[in-house]
Each structure stands twice: as C-alpha cells, then as structure tokens.
Interface confidence: low
C-alpha cells in the first residue's frame, strides 16, 4: 500500500495526517511528542518539528495511535506504533505538528 503524509492547516503547521489504503486519516496524540513530530516533518523535507495539540478535529479514519519514535528514524513507519487503524481515540485527540527547516 502507498503511504504518505500531509499537514492540514497551513503548509508547515496543523493537523498531522497520513495516507494509507487509499484514505487520508489522522494520528491520535496518545504518546505523540516532539520526537514523533521530528520524524513526521522529516518525511516532508523539514529538518525540525515539534508536537502540537488542539489543532482541530479531523474526520474519517484515525490511522495511527501510540506512535513512539526515537527521533532518528527516517519515516514514521520505522517507529513503534499500533497496527493501522487500531486505536482508542476520538478526533478530539488528533495530533498536530509544526515543521521548520
């Protein structure tokens, strides 16, 4: 399956979303921190990132939960995480990022 990421809000700040199995979905903010945000931002070509909360509720799938990156990974898929779609979250817990060069 093709997987990619995007930020919803502005080009570098907003809700973190991932594309999986033909659908965009959100990331639950359980354990979401700066290490995870750095990896997410790296996937978009940025060198820095920080985790945001209260970025606005998304809709549809919540694809990822309990994302646990060290911060050194090249992609989120190398981080510990629940399997796709396995979560105990609502969209009020959607994770956000702010990326910078």
């Amino acid at each position: 399956n093709s997987v990619s990421v995007r930020i919803v809000g502005s080009s570098n700040r907003g809700r973190a979303e991932v594309y999986y199995s033909g659908t965009w979905g959100t990331i639950c903010d359980d354990e979401w921190d700066n290490s995870d945000a750095i990896v997410f931002c790296r996937m978009l070509g940025y060198s820095k990132g920080r985790a945001l909360s209260s970025v606005g509720a998304g809709t549809g799938q919540i694809w990822l939960d309990n994302v646990q990156c060290r911060g050194t990974e090249s992609t989120l898929w190398s981080c510990t995480k629940n399997s796709w779609g396995h979560h105990d979250c609502s969209h009020e817990e959607d994770a956000g990022v702010e990326c910078s060069v």
């Epitope: 354990e31 939960d65 309990n66 994302v67 990974e73 992609t75 981080c79 510990t80 629940n82």
Partner: antibody, heavy 116, light 106 residues
Framework: QVQLKESGPGLVQPSQTLSLTCTVS????????LSWVRQPPGKGLEWIGA???????DYNSALKSRLSISRDTSKSQVLLKMNSLQTEDTAIYFC??????????WGQGVMVTVSS | DIQMTQSPPVLSASVGDRVTLSCKTS??????LDWYQQKHGEAPKLLIY???NLQTGIPSRFSGSGSGTDFTLTISTLQPEDVATYYC????????FGAGTKLELK
C-alpha cells in the same frame, strides 16, 4: 492469536557466539517492533535490543559492540546474535512484541548457560 | 542513562490488604512508564501501560498513578495469586527496568 517462541542452544562455550531465533505468529513483523530482553538467574530484567517494524535496529549501548538483530519476514522470525559470550551472559532470553513502547506479548523464554 | 529505583525491594502483605509499590526515576519520563508482573518461572506480563492504563484482561484491583519522576502501582485488595515480582519500566529515553519488588504473603 499472538504467539512468540524462542529457540536456540541451551549451552554455549565462553568466547563463542550465541544465536537465538524468535518465531512469531498472529501478527506481522513489518507492523511491530520485536525486542529481546534477558534475565540472569535470580536477577532483574535487561533490555538487549530491538528491530523496528521498518527494519531499523536499536541496541543496548553496553552490548552494542557484540550484538546483531535481524529478521526474516518470510519465516516470521527475528534472529539474535551475540558474540564473545562470557559467564555473565548466562540468562533467560525473552523475545517480546513492543506496542507503543510497552511489551504486550512475551515468549516463554529460553535459558542460555555460558560454561565450558 | 535513566536510573530506576523501586521500593521496597521485598514487601510482605496479607490477603485483602491494600498494597502500594513505588518507582522513582532519575529524570522526568513524561508518563512513559509501565508495570510488569512476573511469577516464578514465567515470562513477565504487562499490567499497566503509560503510567495509569490497565492492560486488557488485567483485574481492576491493579491501578497505576504518578507523573514526572514518581510512580506508584496499587493493588486495592491483595489476592493470593498476586504473589510475584513487580517491575517498573521506562521507555522515554532508552529502555530501562527497575530492579523489582518481590511481593510475598504474610
């Protein structure tokens, strides 16, 4: 259901290399991290190292120079190799699935004795 | 490396007691702490994850609390089957287990 099972030699000579295999079922190695944890007789738990779902590895800094963890996804197996074994490496070796940082499923463990 | 200090090393309690086990860390670990139960001759079992979340299938008499550097595992009403060694474990920076608390029956 999720299962993990360790296998390997029960006895290893000092200075030799330990090779252990963890065979899993009920989940995909590409979606989860597999860690190795050991426990010397009568003592506590020590994290050894891990192989991430994306194939990256991470090792205990104290063991890193003698350690290698790899996997064969076609066989649903994770392989641990540790060289230059000494008597203090005698322990029960567990493989365990990691979920969000936590170890949610464990194998039953395999006892490894380092002795001549 | 983060240091984990569990106390007491050994705890004797009676069936029905409320039991509290302590884990202190050498630096802030942002709630990234679990509790594991290990019975003699068995693999460890996850009881509590991310400080205060009860793992599926674990009895509700077990609970976790804390933040920062001080964490607690509580057994509200001790049962005979709770005799075991309990380990705390942090995953905020590397992976480190505490030395364990051995829980015995009086």
């Amino acid at each position: 259901q999720v299962q993990l099972k360790e296998s390997g030699p029960g006895l290893v000579q000092p200075s030799q290399t330990l090779s252990l295999t963890c065979t899993v079922s009920g989940f995909s190695l590409t979606s989860y991290t597999l860690s190795w944890v050991r426990q010397p007789p009568g003592k506590g738990l020590e994290w050894i190292g891990a192989i991430w779902g994306g194939d990256n590895t991470d090792y205990n800094s104290a063991l890193k120079s003698r350690l290698s963890i790899s996997r064969d996804t076609s066989k649903s197996q994770v392989l641990l190799k540790m060289n230059s074994l000494q008597t203090e490496d005698t322990a029960i070796y567990f493989c365990t699935r990691e979920l969000g940082g936590s170890f949610d499923y464990w194998g039953q463990g395999v006892m490894v004795t380092v002795s001549s | 490396d983060i240091q984990m200090t569990q106390s007491p090393p050994v705890l004797s309690a009676s069936v029905g007691d409320r039991v509290t086990l302590s884990c202190k860390t050498s630096q802030n670990i942002n709630k990234k702490l679990d509790w594991y139960q290990q019975k003699h001759g068995e693999a460890p079992k996850l009881l509590i994850y991310y400080t205060n979340n009860l793992q599926t299938g674990i009895p509700s008499r077990f609970s976790g609390s804390g933040s920062g550097t001080d964490f607690t595992l509580t057994i509200s009403t001790l049962q005979p089957e709770d005799v075991a060694t309990y380990y705390c474990y942090q995953y905020d920076s590397g992976f480190t287990f505490g030395a364990g608390t051995k829980l015995e029956l009086k």
